[in-house]
């Protein structure tokens, strides 16, 4: 089940995945300039089994230069593509932690991709927090927030950090010197929604994705 | 007919501009036909070969809100329209539907 | 004429299994997911099964999905009578750079 809302945003501190829940989608974005391939795929998706996990689906950019002006684009969509991809690993995931069950790794970059990585996280899946450069952790309790399903509704529990202005950085488990988050702020427009919209998702289907007819124009 | 129409899905609770929409035809007593689906994040657009030409998909990420236009109704454009989530493992939302008549 | 091919209607009686087969190729069903839809009458169409034989929250576990080679399943265990309603799959097609559904089956529960 996908997590209706991103983690919670802490001022000064960003958070990141040690590995991903089985489920776990990541947009297939490309940096300006560059858009998806024809036969490429919307999302990735993390998928398998409690024994082996893997990304489903592979990203690929090219130049919008080539851009076909019919706008006859045409890439492959995320839910559907059963073709694996090798198992993913990378240097930023510390083995135990990415070798969960039920998890894959952070998938390593592709071409010419965003410089934003974009997940929708499943229920279950937790993400751990850090302060930027410049700021220290005061911790009051876990420094990680959870997906979790509560009476039909998802929600991120809050994680117990604060980050002060002084010039330590607190670290991510398993790192032993502190570094940048590797995907970087994830686009956060809905971080607010756990107050203005109650998970509507969830409990207004009809007003979800509501349909209207717009005034009509004799020609 | 001959009419222009632009019809509105509009989507909360979630992350808009990061998820595909579908929209999908269904015409009186008959099945679902996808049409298409946009990325509200830029706009990127892939349309059914069947609907190519015919209707325009758009989207306007401030309102977060999807459109199907037709810039000249037809008969036989008469059809429920659907607007969906489309996710990794099919549509997981739907719209209650937008039903459209097309009469002389 | 829908690319995936679904019998036009299945019938059973309260508490019986039954199931509904939508057939594909190669481009569609074999090498893509398949997806099913229940569309009650007068509703709008719900997810029922995603990734072949996932259910999402809410559903039902008397709903289950399979698929082999270019075919997949949708069966109902412990049939009621609200479960009267079109069924759909759906699958994306290489081919045709689209989603292509079933043309439906009407479940009627005697």
């Known amino acids: 089940e996908l997590c209706d809302d991103d983690p919670p945003e802490i001022p000064h501190a960003t958070f990141k995945a040690m590995a991903y829940k089985e489920g776990t989608m990541l947009n297939c974005e490309c940096k300006r300039g560059f858009r998806r391939i024809k036969s490429g795929s919307l999302y990735m998706l993390c998928t398998g089994n409690s024994s082996h996990s893997s990304w489903d689906n592979q990203c690929q950019c090219t130049s919008s230069a080539t851009r076909n002006t019919t706008k006859q684009v045409t890439p492959q969509p995320e839910e559907q593509k059963e073709r694996k991809t090798t198992e993913m690993q990378s240097p930023m995931q510390p083995v135990d932690q990415a070798s969960l069950p039920g998890h894959c790794r952070e998938p390593p970059p592709w071409e010419n991709e965003a410089t934003e990585r974009i997940y929708h996280f499943v229920v279950g899946q937790m993400v751990y927090y850090q302060c930027v450069q410049g700021y220290r952790a005061l911790h009051r309790g876990p420094a990680e927030s959870v997906c979790k399903m509560t009476h039909g509704k998802t929600r991120w529990t809050q994680p117990q950090l604060i980050c002060t202005g002084e010039m330590e950085t607190s670290q991510f488990p398993g790192e032993e010197k502190p570094q940048a988050s590797p995907e970087g702020r994830p686009e956060s427009e809905t971080s607010c929604l756990v107050t203005t919209t109650d998970f509507q998702i969830q409990t207004e289907m009809a007003a979800t994705m509501e349909t209207s007819i717009f005034t009509t124009e004799y020609q | 007919p001959g009419e222009s129409l632009k019809i509105s899905c509009k989507g909360s609770g979630y992350s808009f501009t990061t998820y595909w929409i579908a929209w999908v035809r269904q015409m009186p007593g008959k099945g679902l036909e996808w049409m298409g689906i946009i990325y509200p994040g830029d706009s990127d657009t892939t349309y059914s070969p069947s609907f190519q030409g015919q209707v325009t998909i758009s989207a306007d990420k401030s309102i977060t809100t999807t459109y199907l236009q037709w810039s000249s109704l037809k008969a036989s454009d008469t059809a429920m329209y659907y607007c969906?989530?489309?996710?990794?493992?099919?549509?997981?939302?739907w719209g209650q539907g937008t039903l459209v008549t097309v009469s002389s | 004429q829908s690319v995936l091919t679904q019998p036009p209607s299945a019938s059973g009686t309260p508490g019986q299994r039954v199931t509904i087969s939508c057939s594909g190729s190669?481009?569609?069903?074999?090498?893509?997911?398949v997806s099913w839809y229940q569309q009650l009458p007068g509703t709008a169409p719900k997810l029922l099964i995603q990734r072949n034989n996932r259910r999402p929250s809410g559903v039902p576990d008397r709903f289950s999905g399979s698929k082999s080679g270019t075919s997949a399943s949708l069966a109902i265990s412990g049939l009621r009578s609200e479960d009267e309603a079109d069924y759909y799959c759906?699958?994306?097609?290489?081919?045709?750079?689209?989603?292509?559904f079933g043309g439906g089956t009407k479940l009627t529960v005697l």
């Open positions: 969906a989530r489309q996710v990794a493992g099919g549509l997981d939302y």
């Open positions: 759906a699958a994306w097609d290489d081919s045709l750079s689209g989603v292509v």
């Open positions: 190669s481009s569609n069903v074999g090498s893509n997911y």
